[in-house]
Each structure stands twice: as structure tokens, then as C-alpha cells.
């Protein structure tokens, strides 16, 4: 396993609809054709997998149908969007990139993006 640099923004604020987007960029050390991207969430020293996708260079990034993540890839950067977020989902979201094929296998883990989610205030009842 060889190490690889990964960069991502330090902080992102989710929209009022619970959507957060960020870029994950990696320093590809060679001609990888198969790449796996995983988003991990770290909160209270526990790490859980949020979503993952494997893609072939030049093809679209596809997550499972029930995934809360969507994304697009362009060269060695991936644009990730996480939806359905609520205040309790606030945490550090880490981008993990693996170059699966051809060998050698490379692994890169970003420093994480702190995503802040604020639940919208309920609309006050109106008399109209």
C-alpha cells in the first residue's frame, strides 16, 4: 500500500435543505483506471462510512440507489454532494481515495471537511 495526497475544504455549511457539497482532490501518481471514493464521518472519535463509489476513469461516479451521496468526477477531483443532512449529522466528513487498478494500490485520506448542519426553524403558524 502506497500513500497518496488528498485535499478537501476545511469547512462547509449545509444548505437549509440539508445539502452539502465539497470537492475532493487527489494527487494521482500514475495512470489509474479504477478509483474508489469513500466518504467517512468522524464524530465523537467514532468513524462510520457514509457512502462509497467505484468508478472507471472517464466514466460517471455512481453510488448505490439508496445512497445519500451523489457525485461527479473530473480528472483527479471528485465533486461530492451529501443530502438529507440534519443538525445531528454535523461532523467531520473525510474523503478516502483508493487507486484500485492497475497495481500498485494507492491509498489517500484527506484531513476532513467539517460540515455544519443547522435545522431550519419551523415556519410560525399564520392566521391567513
Amino acid at each position: 500500500c502506497k500513500a497518496m495526497h488528498v485535499a478537501q475544504p476545511a469547512v462547509v455549511l449545509a444548505s437549509s435543505r440539508g445539502i452539502a457539497s465539497f470537492v475532493c482532490e487527489y494527487a494521482s501518481p500514475g495512470k489509474a483506471t479504477e478509483v474508489r471514493v469513500t466518504v467517512l464521518r468522524q464524530a465523537d472519535s467514532q468513524v462510520t462510512e457514509v457512502c462509497a463509489a467505484t468508478y472507471m476513469m472517464g466514466n460517471e461516479l455512481t453510488f448505490l440507489d439508496d445512497s445519500i451521496c451523489t457525485g461527479t468526477s473530473s480528472g483527479n477531483q471528485v465533486n461530492l454532494t451529501i443530502q438529507g443532512l440534519r443538525a445531528m449529522d454535523t461532523g467531520l466528513y473525510i474523503c478516502k481515495v483508493e487507486l484500485m487498478y492497475p497495481p500498485p494500490y494507492y491509498l489517500g485520506i484527506g484531513n476532513g471537511t467539517q460540515i455544519y448542519v443547522i435545522d431550519p426553524e419551523p415556519c410560525p403558524d399564520s392566521d391567513f
Epitope: 485535499a7 501518481p29 489509474a32 480528472g75 477531483q77
Partner: nanobody
Amino acid sequence: EVQLVESGGGLVQPGGSLRLSCAASGDTLESFAVGWFRQAPGKEREEVACIGRTGEFTDYPGSVKGRFTITRDNSKNTVYLQMNSLRAEDTAVYYCAAERLVFHLCSLSEYDYDTWGQGTQVTVSS
């Protein structure tokens, strides 16, 4: 859209040095990571060096590490490849390529670059 033009190639003796330039027009190069690649006759194109947008991140394959140095001057919209201790096996057409990125990294994979120059010939021979 950015356009790239390489220059500085030529004939040099083994052990000699050359400095290649990759000049950009049509856009500011500081928005782009830049890579140098080379292709010898009958061989696949191979990676030589890359540099991130700010210049703080560079990468090289083992075949040129310690001999080649990539730098950039964003004020001149130019990236340079300083090649020392040249060998016969360094003979090739050298291409620079650019990729618009958000952060400071760069890639040694030719698959990641979408804009390419026309190339400059480097011949190492006595």
C-alpha cells in the same frame, strides 16, 4: 480556454542540461495544475513531472527524480522543467498539459489532463 506552447528543446550531449518552458495564453495559468509528459518513438507517453496551482506541491516518477525539477512563475504564466544529467533514454518529444483544479495538488496521470501543447523535441546524443 487556455492554450499551451512548449519551447526550449534541442540537441544536448549526455550529462548535459536543458530547460523547457510551457507558456500559457487565453487564461491565467494559476488556476491550473500542470504536468510534463514525454513520448519516445514507438513507446507509450510517460509521466515526467507535475506541479500544483501554487507551486508548493510537485511530484516526479522515479525515473527522473533527483535529475528533473519542475517550477512555475504564475506572473509570467509559465511552467519550467529543468532537466539535468540527461541520458540517451530521455530522448523524446516533451509535452506540457494543464488541468483546472480547486486545491494545490497535481496528477502524474495523463488521463487527468484535458489541455495539451504541441510538444518540443529533446534529443540526447553524443
